[in-house]
Interface confidence: low
């Protein structure tokens, strides 16, 4: 018969014959022959291959480097790579999550609109009129100005986006 020019799914063409690919989690040791099947071996402890393949070496699992703020989210298997994520309080600097950065803080005059997650940074917003923030914080929202009226006091010093109002006693009219 004519030698094949194409092979079925999960096969590959070598030396004019179709050999079975190695299944995920295994690497190729030797190609098939007219008389023998493809020989495959399982990947080692910290290795993986995630597709049907003819690779002679497995890939190393990703290392989640704690010095980059990373930790293991999902341990790798012989068929899957390790998935890294950031330590609590940090978020990935890229989609591949190769390193992390500490969540940023919102400066005075700004409050936290959205608290950071493992993949997104803190979102800050300017404190609108009637609100203030006098600290740099990764968690605090803008606080409303104190209502002097509800305390039977008057505004002695107006508030800003960074400072609260200062309340003081009402001037008593003398009889």
């Amino acid at each position: 018969p004519e030698p094949p020019t194409a092979c079925r799914e999960k096969q590959y063409l070598i030396n004019s014959q179709c050999c079975s690919l190695c299944q995920p989690g295994q690497k190729l040791v030797s190609d098939c022959t007219e008389f023998t099947e493809t020989e495959c071996l399982p990947c080692g402890e910290s290795e993986f291959l995630d597709t049907w393949n003819r690779e002679t070496h497995c890939h190393q699992h990703k290392y989640c480097d704690p010095n980059l703020g990373l930790r293991v989210q999902q341990k790798g298997t012989s068929e899957t790579d390790t998935i890294c994520t950031c330590e609590e309080g940090w978020h990935c600097t890229s989609e591949a999550c190769e390193s992390c950065v500490l969540h940023r803080s919102c400066s005075p005059g700004f409050g936290v609109k959205q608290i950071a997650t493992g993949v997104s940074d803190t979102i800050c917003e300017p404190c609108p009129v009637g609100f203030f923030s006098n600290v740099s914080s990764a968690f605090e929202k803008c606080h409303p100005w104190t209502s002097c009226e509800t305390k039977d006091l008057v505004v002695q010093q107006a508030g800003t986006n960074k400072t609260d109002v200062v309340c003081g006693p009402q001037d008593r009219l003398r009889a």
């Epitope: 940090w90 992390c100 950065v101 940023r104 803080s105 740099s136 914080s137």
Partner: nanobody, 119 residues
Amino acid sequence: EVQLLESGGGLVQPGGSLRLSCAASGFTFGDAAMTWVRQAPGKGLEWVSAIQPMGDGTYYADSVKGRFTVSRDNSKNTLYLQMNSLRAEDTAVYYCAKGRIPTLQFDYWGQGTLVTVSS
């Protein structure tokens, strides 16, 4: 000019305690995230701990969790690292750094203080 000056290092027995301080100047300390890193003899830098500007977020490497406590006094422009239950493997030069990345990419570094844990 930004300056970071660590102090408090020394020789301590295993199981003992030390408190490191880092005096900061030349920038608005209360607006800056701060980090402690260390370098053991003949080894690379290791991130130890970090703290948010207001101290409302503190973070630790697994190797020191439950033993070390980071804190800060913004009124004194000072960062602290309380180290308890010290082990031989904690022997290192400890540096404070201004910045929010747990690697070498800090804005500014201190000169370091040596902690030796030995009996």
